[in-house]
């Protein structure tokens, strides 16, 4: 039941002081990692 503030997409843009590495270090769920690598593919 319930969850959290759901993101429609992983990142529209990097937030202040965030790098791809710092985001990578915060990922928790399988879905987080999937969104992250999808984001990387789309930004190439």
């Amino acid at each position: 039941g319930g969850g959290g503030s759901k993101h429609k997409c992983f990142r529209n843009s990097l937030e202040n002081n965030e790098t791809l590495e710092s985001i990578m270090n915060t990922l928790e769920s399988e879905e987080d990692f999937r969104k992250y690598f999808y984001y990387l593919e789309g930004s190439k």
Partner: antibody, heavy 119, light 107 residues
């Protein structure tokens, strides 16, 4: 339904070790990050540690860094907290908690297990 | 680290009262704020996520609002089962941090 059943608490002397377990059921345990949160007697809640899907990322609070180790066994659907070099100030009820992912709120908690560090 | 300051630390209220608890973050956390209810000897229960979204199964007498640094939890009409301690928590960044709690007692 989702269940997080904890075990492993007890009384331990300062400097000794203890391992807590959190057995999960009712959801795809291996797909989610898991957390430990603690509460000293009569005090508020304090985040302790997190382990990600696959154990890729681990983070700890400054108060336990270097002494506690979070781990998981996805084949057993179980989360662990190995606590070494225990101190009196580690005395608390320890809770495991689940959330859907980074920047999601906790949705389920274990029942808690009391760790008492005393000589 | 992001500090979460909750107020008041305790309050006395009567059944039927409207109760408001506030939580302030030391820096902006967007809407990455949750509220929990805890009764003595029990695990916390998740009430609200995303500052204002009700967890599944939580009655609508609970509501949350706010964004950025200032947040509130409101109980529209206090019932006997609502006497408990309430905590806010930010989950914008590690380390995840909690407010100090607000104990709601019977007047």
């Amino acid at each position: 339904q989702v269940q997080l059943v904890q075990s492993g608490g007890g009384v331990v002397q300062p400097g000794r070790s203890l391992r807590l377990s959190c057995a999960a059921s009712g959801f795809s345990f291996s797909s989610f990050g898991m957390h430990w949160v603690r509460q000293a007697p009569g005090k508020g809640l304090e985040w302790v540690a997190v382990i990600s899907y696959g154990g890729i990322n681990k983070h700890y609070s400054d108060s336990v860094k270097g002494r506690f180790t979070i781990s998981r066994d996805d084949s057993k659907n179980t989360l662990y907290l190995q606590m070494n070099s225990l101190r009196a100030e580690d005395t608390a009820v320890y809770y495991c908690a689940k959330r859907e992912g980074y920047r999601y709120a906790y949705d389920y908690w274990g029942q808690g297990t009391l760790v008492t560090v005393s000589s | 680290d992001i500090q979460m300051t909750q107020s008041p630390s305790s309050l006395s209220a009567s059944v039927g009262d409207r109760v408001t608890i506030t939580c302030r973050a030391s820096q902006g956390i967007s809407n990455y704020l949750a509220w929990f209810q805890q009764k003595p000897g029990k695990a916390p229960k998740s009430l609200i996520y995303g500052a204002s979204s009700l967890q599944s199964g939580v009655p609508s007498k609970f509501s949350g609002s706010g964004s950025g640094t200032d947040f509130t939890l409101t109980i529209s009409s206090l019932q006997p089962e609502d006497f408990a301690t309430y905590y806010c928590q930010q989950y914008n960044s590690y380390p995840l941090t909690f407010g100090g709690g607000t104990k709601v007692e019977i007047k």
